[in-house]
Each structure stands twice: as structure tokens, then as C-alpha cells.
Interface confidence: medium
């Protein structure tokens, strides 16, 4: 997987009036990294991992950049002509990637009220838009505004591409984010489900990257999908991920079941703990 930096900026308008606040979230390699939720914001590192990447006293730069980007997006929202009554949002998502072969990708996407209406490849400067007439009207409106000062636009988007990659490389230099493998901690618990049955839950946490196989096996054979319930693979705030899988089994059959985990080429199996059922809850 490539290394990536993703900026997600959102500004709001109410009855055609652009609000002063904005929300910016930054994800590094898919992990929540920075958050800025006031006009005069402090960029808030999302967990110790982000602080380790940023190092001491380097958040001013991020705060300045994110605040500037928020102002630019508010100006763009002010130029959208079909503002209707009520609450509306304009969202800009900007992503840059560095692949293993050192090639790069950069793109920018605009959403109005959650609907994608305009995208740009920041390397080729190629614009694309959906087919719907509303999206096309919005897209022309925004694109024309962004092109009003052609010189500014050219330098602006070149800078956006270059700055994003520069920031990504700077974060990678910290060494904390460099492509790494962190194996999961796997924990199996059991809880009473109904008379004669127990729910067994297998949790994997603290792993990186996010790709993981977690499933229940009976007699060494994977259970069918419809007999298992999976949790989402979610960031845990430490630059790593967590997930779970659960199934219901007959009490007394525990030794026939294993939780199978595969991650980054390594795999392991984990037994159902024996003993009394202490937790009275059910995932179903």
C-alpha cells in the first residue's frame, strides 16, 4: 500500500451565509492524524502516535496551513450561486500518495451536501465531474471561480500538490510512520448467549497495516459467513487498528473451535478459554 496524506475540509452555510467555523481532519496512512475544529484552531494531534510523528512545537505550521485552507474553502462556498435556505456544506478532500516505486498521485474532490460534484487530478490538472445536471452546474460554478485568476490557480494547485507531498515526506522522515508491521494482540472471550449456548468473541487489536483475516474455525474448517458476525476494522488512536469476530457455539464444544488470525504473512490460532461464563451479554 502507498503512504498517503488525506485532508478533509468542511465549511457550512446557513440561509446563504457562510459560517465562520470550519472542520478539518487529516489522515496519515489512513489513520486519524490531526483535527482542527475552530476558525482560529490549534491542530490537535489524534493520539500519542500523531504527536510522535509531528515532534515538539511543529504544530504551528499545520495550524497555519489548515486555517488558510479553511478560508479558501469558505470563499469558494460563498461563490456557489444556488444556495438555498437552511444548512449546506461544502467539503474538499485532498489526497496525495507516495507509492513503493516512488511514483506519486494527487487528487482533489469537492462535495456539496455530501454529493461529489467535482474532482481534479492535481498532477495532470484534469477535471472530472458526474453526469447529473445539478452536479454539473455546481462544478462549472466552482471551477470558474477557481480559474478566475489563472495564474493564481496554476501556482495554487501546483503548490497544493507539492505541499501535500512535502508534508507527507516530512511526516515519513519522523520514522514513526515508515512502512512497518505491528502484529495484533488477539484475545478470545466467552459470554452466555442462551441456555446451552455461548457467544465467543475474538478481538484483534494494536495491528498495522489494517488488512487482517479474523475468523472462527470449527474442527479446523472456517465457519460459513452467515454464522459469524464481524466488527469493522477501526483505528484505535495509536496508529494501529482493532477489530473483532463473534459466533455462537454449544457449551461443551469449545475445544472444537479456534479463532484464526492472519496478518502480514503471519498466522496464529487461538482457543476458547475454558471455565465459567462470567460475562452476561450477547453480540447477537
Amino acid at each position: 500500500e502507498p503512504h498517503s496524506l488525506r485532508y478533509n475540509l468542511t465549511v457550512l452555510s446557513w440561509d446563504g451565509s457562510v459560517q465562520s467555523g470550519f472542520l478539518t481532519e487529516v489522515h496519515l496512512d489512513g489513520q486519524p492524524f490531526l483535527r482542527c475544529d475552530r476558525q482560529k484552531c490549534r491542530a490537535k494531534p489524534q493520539g500519542q502516535w500523531a504527536e510522535d510523528v509531528l515532534g515538539n512545537k511543529t504544530w504551528d505550521r499545520e495550524t497555519r496551513d489548515l486555517t488558510g485552507n479553511g478560508k479558501d474553502l469558505r470563499m469558494t462556498l460563498a461563490h456557489i450561486k444556488d444556495q438555498k435556505e437552511g444548512l449546506h456544506s461544502l467539503q474538499e478532500i485532498r489526497v496525495c500518495e507516495i507509492h513503493e516505486d516512488n511514483s506519486t498521485r494527487s487528487s482533489q474532490h469537492f462535495y456539496y451536501d455530501g454529493e461529489l460534484f467535482l474532482s481534479q487530478n492535481l498532477e495532470t490538472k484534469e477535471w472530472t465531474m458526474p453526469q447529473s445536471s445539478r452536479a454539473q452546474t455546481l462544478a462549472m460554478n466552482v471551477r470558474n471561480f477557481l480559474k478566475e485568476d489563472a495564474m493564481k490557480t496554476k501556482t495554487h494547485y501546483h503548490a497544493m500538490h507539492a505541499d501535500c507531498l512535502q508534508e507527507l515526506r516530512r511526516y515519513l522522515k519522523s520514522g514513526v510512520v515508515l512502512r512497518r508491521t505491528v502484529p495484533p494482540m488477539v484475545n478470545v472471550t466467552r459470554s452466555e448467549a442462551s441456555e446451552g449456548n455461548i457467544t465467543v468473541t475474538c478481538r484483534a487489536s494494536g495491528f498495522y497495516p489494517w488488512n487482517i483475516t479474523l475468523s472462527w474455525r470449527q474442527d479446523g474448517v472456517s465457519l460459513s459467513h452467515d454464522t459469524q458476525q464481524w466488527g469493522d476494522v477501526l483505528p484505535d488512536g495509536n496508529g494501529t487498528y482493532q477489530t473483532w469476530v463473534a459466533t455462537r457455539i454449544c457449551q461443551g464444544e469449545e475445544q472444537r473451535f479456534t479463532c484464526y488470525m492472519e496478518h502480514s504473512g503471519n498466522h496464529s490460532t487461538h482457543p476458547v478459554p475454558s471455565g465459567k461464563v462470567l460475562v452476561l451479554q450477547s453480540h447477537w
Partner: antibody
Framework: DVQLQESGPGLVKPSQSLSLTCTVT?????????WNWIRQFPGNKLEWMGF???????KYNPSLKSRISITRDTSENQFFLQLNSVTSEDTATYYC????????WGQGTTLTVSS | EIVLTQSPTTMAASPGEKITITCSAT???????FHWYQQRPGFSPKLLIY???NLASGVPARFSGSGSGTSYSLTIGTMEAEDVATYYC?????????FGSGTKLEIK
Amino acid sequence: DVQLQESGPGLVKPSQSLSLTCTVTGYSITSDYAWNWIRQFPGNKLEWMGFVSYSGTTKYNPSLKSRISITRDTSENQFFLQLNSVTSEDTATYYCARGYGFDYWGQGTTLTVSS
Amino acid sequence: EIVLTQSPTTMAASPGEKITITCSATSSISSIYFHWYQQRPGFSPKLLIYRTSNLASGVPARFSGSGSGTSYSLTIGTMEAEDVATYYCQQGTTIPFTFGSGTKLEIK
């Protein structure tokens, strides 16, 4: 490739104890599955004797429960059968096998109980 | 314990013939805990069909299995010389796990 290999004395005197070893290669006995002892009598009847599971749980055939013990050595990836107070009725070929649907078997070791 | 009764005890078949072996249980068995084994003369038993109807690795497609509850069967679509063996059914639903008494298949 998973392989199981039984080893044992071949001849045991009545009333003595029988000890057999199953050495597993190509798969860790702590990873998954049950690790079984099965025997086949001279008339070809098969009898499941018991297992030790990957987690260390043991289950035995009630007909042998007072005489049988299955243990393991995880560092050597081996599991063992001990059968006490043997008689001529225990003369059989003894197999170790993996799983519940026994997908891998050893080649078997023939045990004769005779004075 | 669950007793498995196989029939026939022995049978002889010509090459190309269709063969069916049945296994009847004294109590209902979960289909995921029912298996068939083949034992050729002088060899260890070999898993043939697992979980009632799934062919074990390397088993030819002429073998098939079916059944549920207390009644299960093994079918050889077209008998071949290499199929000469004793066939055993086995249940893993309840302890003790038990085997059928075997069906010895010979070639005419």
C-alpha cells in the same frame, strides 16, 4: 506437508503399561485440531481411544477412561498414549491421527500383548 | 454411544459399476461431524469424504457422499480397480467418536 509417526515397544506383557509416542512434523500441535489415538483390532474394527486438543483439553473413550492417559510435549511437537493394565484384548495396530474428521494418519505401530 | 451399522459388509463389483454403501446410526448425527474413510490393504485409513459430502484432497470426483440425521451413504459413480479397499463411516457428534464396522469392496 503434515506427517505423523507412531513409535512404541511392539511387545508388552499383560498387566504392564503401554506407552506410545506420536511425533508430528509440518504442523504445530498447539495451532489447531485434536490429536487422536485410534486403534484397529485384528478383525479390522476401528476404535477411537481419545484425543488431546490444540489447547490441551483431553477427551477419552469411556470404555478406556480408567486406564488411558494422553499427554503432550509441545516443545517436541509430540503427544503420547499411556494405557495401563494391558491384556491380550489390547493387541492391535495403534494409529495417531489429526482432527475430528481424521485428515492425517500415522502409518501405525503394531502392538502385541503377550507373556 | 452412537453405533454405526454399515451395509453391505462385503461386496464385489465389476469395473464401471456404480456402488452405494450405506451407514445407519442409532442416534441423529450432525452432518458436519460425519466422515468416510478408505483403507487399502496394508495401509492406514485415509480420509475420503468429510462433513458428509466434501471430497478430501486428491480424492477422485467419482466418489460422492450424502445423507443427514441417521442415514448416510457413500457412492462410487464408476468402480475402478484401485477402489478395492475397506470403507468406514465415522461420527464425531458425540464422544466416544465411533466408526462403522466397515464395508469390504472387491472387484469381480
